[in-house]
Interface confidence: low
């Protein structure tokens, strides 16, 4: 049973509470929502920096590009863009910087042409596992998404739940195998400490993967083997210390790959020998001549390409009886 939507005017919070609006009848095809700018010729609607607290209900049916940036949406409920008739043309949706802290299951359902989605710069404390798949079935209908931009969606430390942020994001990416057609995935600036091992294997169509400006320490358990279409892999500004043989071999085996590794704290000891040898031979690393050692102190700022095996030693580990204080 259903009941009339009630007023939420007595609510207050740092992010406004949303009650979905009731749309009595379909919008006129040429109608432009209040606080938005519309161009039918460009099939574009812009509702930018307007402090909107909900998605306008009267979006024109022609909209192909929708910008809802710089608002205060707080919550995207299920079917937030479901309309009668549906927004069948909507292909690019930008919701960046709109203070979203929750994206619910099925938030993007009924958008059959949605190819690009940008949720960047929203503190997503609660991203439903079924935000993109819209279904809790083990195999969902394929999503039309080709590009998914999720840069800087990590919430402040005090708003994070007692669960892995990485795990929450990956669960949404993998649910129902709906994103098999995804070609571009951007996850920059999210404080990721690790990459769950199954994520890449289940996104086989990826061409571009951006993991820059995270806190990744190691890629030891990450497999790139199945990403045969991968063209760019951005790993700049992480906490990588060394790439091991298995990773090097997998990257070298990808036919179209370009890897970006700048600004990582490379540890130039005996474990770095394989990576240095590989760097000298490979064509896949962009700007490889800029990669420098961060540790140990005696190696700081040395260029990796200029190192030889004699430079890459590991201090012997002394037995406790011989250690001095």
């Amino acid at each position: 049973s259903s009941s009339p939507t009630s007023s939420a005017s007595s609510f207050s919070s740092s992010a406004p509470f949303l009650a979905s609006a009731v749309s009595a009848q379909p919008p006129l095809p040429d109608q432009c929502p209040a606080l938005c700018e519309c161009s039918e010729a460009a099939r574009t609607v812009k509702c930018v920096n307007r402090n909107l607290t909900e998605v306008p209900t009267d979006l024109p049916a022609y909209v192909r590009n929708l910008f809802l940036t710089g608002n205060q949406l707080a919550v995207l409920p299920a079917g937030a863009f479901a309309r009668r008739p549906p927004l069948a043309e909507l292909a690019a949706l930008n919701l960046s910087g709109s203070r979203l802290d929750e994206v619910r299951a099925g938030a993007f359902e009924h958008l059959p042409s949605l190819r690009q989605l940008d949720l960047s710069h929203n503190p997503l404390a609660d991203l439903s596992p079924f935000a993109f798949s819209g279904s809790n079935a083990s195999v969902s209908a394929p999503s039309p998404l080709v590009e998914l931009i999720l840069n800087h969606i990590v919430p402040p430390e005090d708003e994070r739940q007692n669960r892995s942020f990485e795990g929450m994001v990956v669960a949404a990416l993998l649910a129902g195998r709906a994103l098999q057609g995804l070609r571009r995935l951007e996850l920059a600036s999210n404080h990721f400490l690790y990459l769950p091992r199954d994520v890449l294997a289940q996104l086989p169509s990826l061409r571009h993967l951006d993991l820059s400006n995270n806190s990744l320490v190691s890629l030891t358990y990450v497999s790139f083997r199945n990403l045969t279409h991968l063209e760019s892999l951005h790993l700049e500004d992480n906490a990588l210390k060394v790439l091991h043989n298995g990773t090097l071999a997998e990257l070298q085996g990808l036919p179209h790959i370009r890897v970006f590794l700048d600004n990582n704290p490379w540890v130039c000891d005996c474990h770095m020998a394989d990576m240095v040898t590989w760097l000298k031979e490979t064509e896949v690393v962009q700007g490889k001549d800029r990669l420098t050692c961060a540790y140990p102190e005696k190696m700081r700022n040395r260029v990796l390409l200029e190192l030889n095996s004699a430079d890459l030693d590991c201090d012997p580990i002394l037995p406790p009886s011989l250690q001095t204080s």
Epitope: S1, S2, T5, A15, A19, S20, A21, V22, S23, T57, V75, P77, A78, G79, A80, A82, R84, D101, E102, R104, A105, G106, E109, A125, D126, S128, P129, F130, N136, E159, R160, Q161, R163
Partner: nanobody, 120 residues
Framework: QVQLVESGGGLVQPGGSLRLSCAAS????????MSWYRQAPGEERELVAS????????RYADSVKGRFTISRDNAKNTVYLQMNSLKPEDTAVYYC?????????????WGEGTLVTVSA
């Protein structure tokens, strides 16, 4: 079939406490935000509190902030409303709500409600 069953209502004196429960079935409870509404006689139904899917974020009506606490147990498919320092103006029928889709398409679901009476 979606079902929401509220319990825990009753008569309580001003300043007293009650804990309402809402048992959910027929949908993947952990994937949806849940809310409590209330409706006093002759008044419009109003939002009281809501909680996000994993309980990481809660929101409250101004009139109940600091007195009411919403929580959920996804293992038990249950959402709770702890009501302290109750006032006569809290008297109403309290409804549990699950918004499984757009309200405009009739995809939100309600329980039958449980009556809370605050009176000396």
């Amino acid at each position: 079939q979606v079902q929401l069953v509220e319990s825990g209502g009753g008569l309580v004196q001003p300043g007293g406490s009650l804990r309402l429960s809402c048992a959910a079935s027929g949908f993947t409870f952990s994937s949806y935000a849940m809310s409590w509404y209330r409706q006093a006689p002759g008044e419009e139904r109003e939002l009281v509190a809501s909680i996000t899917t994993a309980g990481g974020s809660t929101r409250y009506a101004d009139s109940v902030k600091g007195r009411f606490t919403i929580s959920r147990d996804n293992a038990k498919n249950t959402v709770y409303l702890q009501m302290n320092s109750l006032k006569p103006e809290d008297t109403a029928v309290y409804y549990c709500n699950a918004e499984l889709g757009p309200r405009r398409l009739g995809m939100d679901y309600w329980g039958e409600g449980t009556l809370v009476t605050v009176s000396a």
